[in-house]
Amino acid sequence: LEETLLNTKLETADLKWVTFPQVDGQWEELSGLDEEQHSVRTYEVCDVQRAPGQAHWLRTGWVPRRGAVHVYATLRFTMLECLSLPRAGRSCKETFTVFYYESDADTATALTPAWMENPYIKVDTVAAEHLTRKRPGAEATGKVNVKTLRLGPLSKAGFYLAFQDQGACMALLSLHLFYKKCAQLTVNLTRFPETVPRELVVPVAGSCVVDAVPAPGPSPSLYCREDGQWAEQPVTGCSCAPGFEAAEGNTKCRACAQGTFKPLSGEGSCQPCPANSHSNTIGSAVCQCRVGYFRARTDPRGAPCTTPPSAPRSVVSRLNGSSLHLEWSAPLESGGREDLTYALRCRECRPGGSCAPCGGDLTFDPGPRDLVEPWVVVRGLRPDFTYTFEVTALNGVSSLATGPVPFEPVNVTTDREVPPAVSDIRVTRSSPSSLSLAWAVPRAPSGAVLDYEVKYHEKGAEGPSSVRFLKTSENRAELRGLKRGASYLVQVRARSEAGYGPFGQEHHSQTQLDESEGWREQLA
């Protein structure tokens, strides 16, 4: 990028540069018109018959350097060929010399600084590449010379440029004074300010563009070269903040549009809001969950929003004495999550009707909560109690929801307790055809024993037709019509209002071989 300090092509007033000495044959200002009929100014000199050692100086106005360390001067000039000048003597030249003088203010006068090299600093002696030929009465022909010179290093507030003619016939058509600077550059979301190079290469610190954040690591920098070009160097530096994506060739961060989001800083573009979420503003780093939907604390910010599951379905109970097996189907709606678990709540009601949460005597296998399979076994149920089990399905966002948790209930009433097994049977008397039996009255928890059932069969005769039953209301019984000297297996069970208890252990008894042995008491 070039920053102009002076361009005579753009000057609208007389330049009125200073000449020295005040003699004939000096530089003179002329004007012309460009294609748009705007005035353009030039300087001409043509003292080809000058006295030896006589120089014609032309000095520009004071030019503030505006921080430039090196300034470039592009000269456009034409130079008349000495051979085309009939009056040209040996002092005719086809070169001129360029100088500059630095000062902190516009202090030069018509006589100072002294018109000579030192204090003036010589830049170069300029020779014409193209010479203009002029024949009498004809128009001059020849190409314009363009020469760019480099001034510096400069340190004062400004400078003057001076041209010294020592016998040329030439026209200085235009002067462009400029310095080179690295233009403001935005690359990889990092902005590097416009920089005037003060050395061969200058490191320039970058700053993140609006809505970008620095990447970890060293802060981004780029090198501005003396020629006004940025040194090519990969720049990692900044990335768009959450809620913003890179745009316009990685030169700016654009806010995510409504309905999109970007959760992290860094590369990547805004994504549509995940399921069951929305963003009503631009620049969203996260999409808000719809009413009734949530993200668990452990869910990524970009995860869909989910909802608690519906209740489990079709709870099936199988009661087996004091044990209960419950089984159910998964809820219709999982809420959009994989982390489904089940939990049970339990209430028990006594026969009298008073109800309370289940006591600690119940055990749940594998447990009352955090169940991953849809079943549980409950043990330790008490007889003649009514149990209500509420089966709930839960997931990672159930704890975030307000309102009741849906459940599927199941009611189970346990049987009243039947009498225990009768096991201590003894034979009180035996004969060849009968056996008299007695047993202890079992302790029935739910009311008295109403009667007993005796089940017996001859040992070795196992078929259903060989089994015989006898009911008795006392805790004794006589089995008649038995075979002589045969072995019998006897079992007894008691009945209360709750029903029959289990048969006790088989008792082994034997009938007499003959009458002579008489009645004999036998103990089991």
């Epitope: 609208t12 007389d14 009125k16 012309g32 018109l33 705007h38 008349l80 026209a171």
Partner: antibody, heavy 126, light 108 residues
Framework: QVQLVESGGGLVQPGGSLRLSCAAS????????MSWVRQAPGKGLEWVSA????????SYADSVKGRFTISRDNSKNTLYLQMNSLRAEDTAVYYC???????????????????WGQGTLVTVSS | DIELTQPPSVSVAPGQTARISCSGD??????VHWYQQKPGQAPVLVIY???KRPSGIPERFSGSNSGNTATLTISGTQAEDEADYYC???????????FGGGTKLTVL
């Protein structure tokens, strides 16, 4: 010798036309930027019109714009001023004048008039 | 556009210095030229580029220009210097020339 000689002046009625000529000699006319300057009786100098060396650029004072036309014939070393719709206030001595010339580049000229003709009187009256 | 203002007349005794002023806004930033016109004659350039003298013009004629005023100075004025003097400068485009109203120099 180097000189400019105007001709074509005279008496003309208001609304009438007149064409002034300026014959150049003694210098390379086709390298010179030329102008017309007038001077009303007892008054000061007033610039009227200008033309560049090749004749492609022209310029006029507001007082004559649209009525006067400057032109040149470099092959005849002559400058012209065609004056139409003349008014009484156009009565003046009309001078042709040469701008200071470049040494060799007719695209440019100095801003002063370094050569003047003797003038020609134009009288606009009924 | 610039307007150039001159005093209508200036009088000077022979041999004395005559100064004729020409004023205009920021005139010092423009080149000013001076013309001498004697009765019945065409104007003659006496000073150009503020202070330069064309060949054939006596050394007693000099010029300066700064600020808002340009000055034509005739030192050791002679009777033959009696004439009208006009300053001129160009306006915003180089082809438009403006003249001052003229100053009549009388040599007493």
């Amino acid at each position: 010798q180097v000189q400019l000689v105007e001709s074509g002046g005279g008496l003309v009625q208001p609304g009438g036309s007149l064409r002034l000529s300026c014959a150049a000699s003694g210098f390379t006319f086709n390298n010179a930027w030329m102008s017309w300057v007038r001077q009303a009786p007892g008054k000061g100098l007033e610039w009227v019109s200008a033309i560049n060396a090749k004749g492609q650029f022209t310029s006029y004072a507001d007082s004559v714009k649209g009525r006067f036309t400057i032109s040149r014939d470099n092959s005849k070393n002559t400058l012209y001023l065609q004056m139409n719709s003349l008014r009484a206030e156009d009565t003046a001595v009309y001078y042709c004048a040469r701008k200071g010339m470049s040494f060799y580049n007719n695209k440019y000229a100095k801003s002063m008039f370094d050569l003047w003709g003797q003038g020609t009187l134009v009288t606009v009256s009924s | 556009d610039i307007e150039l203002t001159q005093p209508p007349s200036v009088s000077v005794a022979p041999g004395q210095t005559a100064r004729i002023s020409c004023s205009g806004d920021n005139l010092g930033k423009k080149y000013v030229h001076w013309y001498q016109q004697k009765p019945g004659q065409a104007p003659v350039l006496v000073i150009y580029y503020d202070s330069k003298r064309p060949s054939g013009i006596p050394e007693r004629f000099s010029g300066s220009n700064s600020g808002n005023t340009a000055t034509l100075t005739i030192s050791g004025t002679q009777a033959e210097d009696e004439a009208d003097y006009y300053c001129s400068a160009w306006t915003t485009t180089m082809m438009h020339i403006v003249f001052g109203g003229g100053t009549k120099l009388t040599v007493l």
